[in-house]
């Protein structure tokens, strides 16, 4: 372990499509991967007319986009499907949308996931 870095061993798991995919709907997912590579958690969601619909949450493989991110924050401006990743156990329990604007000051859009 590297000092000052939170290692990810488990993430919140959610699958909106659980019946079709034949998985659990929600739970805790242990994260596997090559021993020397970093592991992360992710969340994906949609914003349907202002209502937040979680699509999936779970483990994410080694990705420099997620390094040292303790919070799960989507920064892309108005994506079709929102995606964020983070490091640290269960760091994907909460997620938010904070688009990086070119000129204007960014405004935070915190997301409170609806319980399944």
């Amino acid at each position: 372990a590297i000092l000052g870095r939170s290692e990810t061993q488990e993430c919140l798991f959610f699958n909106a499509n659980w019946e079709k995919d034949r998985t659990n709907q929600t739970g805790v997912e242990p994260c596997y991967g090559d021993k020397d590579k970093r592991r992360h958690c992710f969340a994906t969601w949609k914003n349907i007319s202002g209502s937040i619909e979680i699509v999936k949450q779970g483990c994410w493989l080694d990705d420099i986009n997620c390094y040292d991110r303790t919070d799960c924050v989507e920064k892309k401006d108005s994506p079709e499907v929102y995606f964020c990743c983070c490091e640290g156990n269960m760091c994907n329990e909460k997620f938010s949308y904070f688009p990086e604007m070119e000129v204007t000051q960014p405004t935070s859009n915190p997301v409170t996931p609806k319980p399944p």
């Epitope: 992710f42 999936k56 483990c59 080694d62 990705d63 420099i64 986009n65 994506p79 499907v81 995606f83």
Partner: antibody
Framework: QVQLVQSGAEVKKPGSSVKVSCKAS????????INWVRQAPGQGLEWMGT????????SYAQKFQGRVTITADESTSTAYMELSSLRSEDTAVYYC????????WGQGTLVTVSS | QSALTQPRSVSGSPGQSVTISCTGT?????????VNWYQQHPGKAPKLMIY???KRESGVPDRFSGSKSGNTASLTISGLQAEDEADYYC???????????FGGGTKLTVL
Amino acid sequence: QVQLVQSGAEVKKPGSSVKVSCKASGYTFTSSYINWVRQAPGQGLEWMGTINAVSGSTSYAQKFQGRVTITADESTSTAYMELSSLRSEDTAVYYCARGGWFDYWGQGTLVTVSS
Amino acid sequence: QSALTQPRSVSGSPGQSVTISCTGTSSDVGSYNYVNWYQQHPGKAPKLMIYGVSKRESGVPDRFSGSKSGNTASLTISGLQAEDEADYYCGTFAGGKYYGVFGGGTKLTVL
């Protein structure tokens, strides 16, 4: 073990399109990216684009923008790369690779463009 | 993003060490630790050897090592063996906000 299995060789006419598939197994398909790379005969590797397998978000190399479409089907753990308006210079072996580090590769698919 | 620059070929005798360079710019190789090295034997798919500049991929012999100085990343192979004869490519991480790019490749000949 992680495996990426690609579809078979294709022979295409100039102006047509080709769609190459890449079926993943041995890991959770929706836990990373799938990248596409091509290699013309006797030439080096050329990055074409990537897809986030869970969100469907894509990025393409400028050279292929507007001509390439990368998609992913979660239900079958399969990624696809479609290249349109084919020309003879597109004759190459096309590879898919897992993740941002390209840590596992498919066996390659030879696409020959010839009239 | 423009291609990374590699020497066309390098050679060495068994047991010797060789170093392959990969030069980029201050905005890619110089700024981030995201350069990787791939080995490709004729007719085969490339194989990841080194990722994140200096991390050895699982199962890769410790004869292979990676480093970086300024805008140039390097792959060093010590104790050259006949099976090391192959093409070697440097490349960058690709995914999310990062776009991929490869070097032109270096042919390593073991004399």
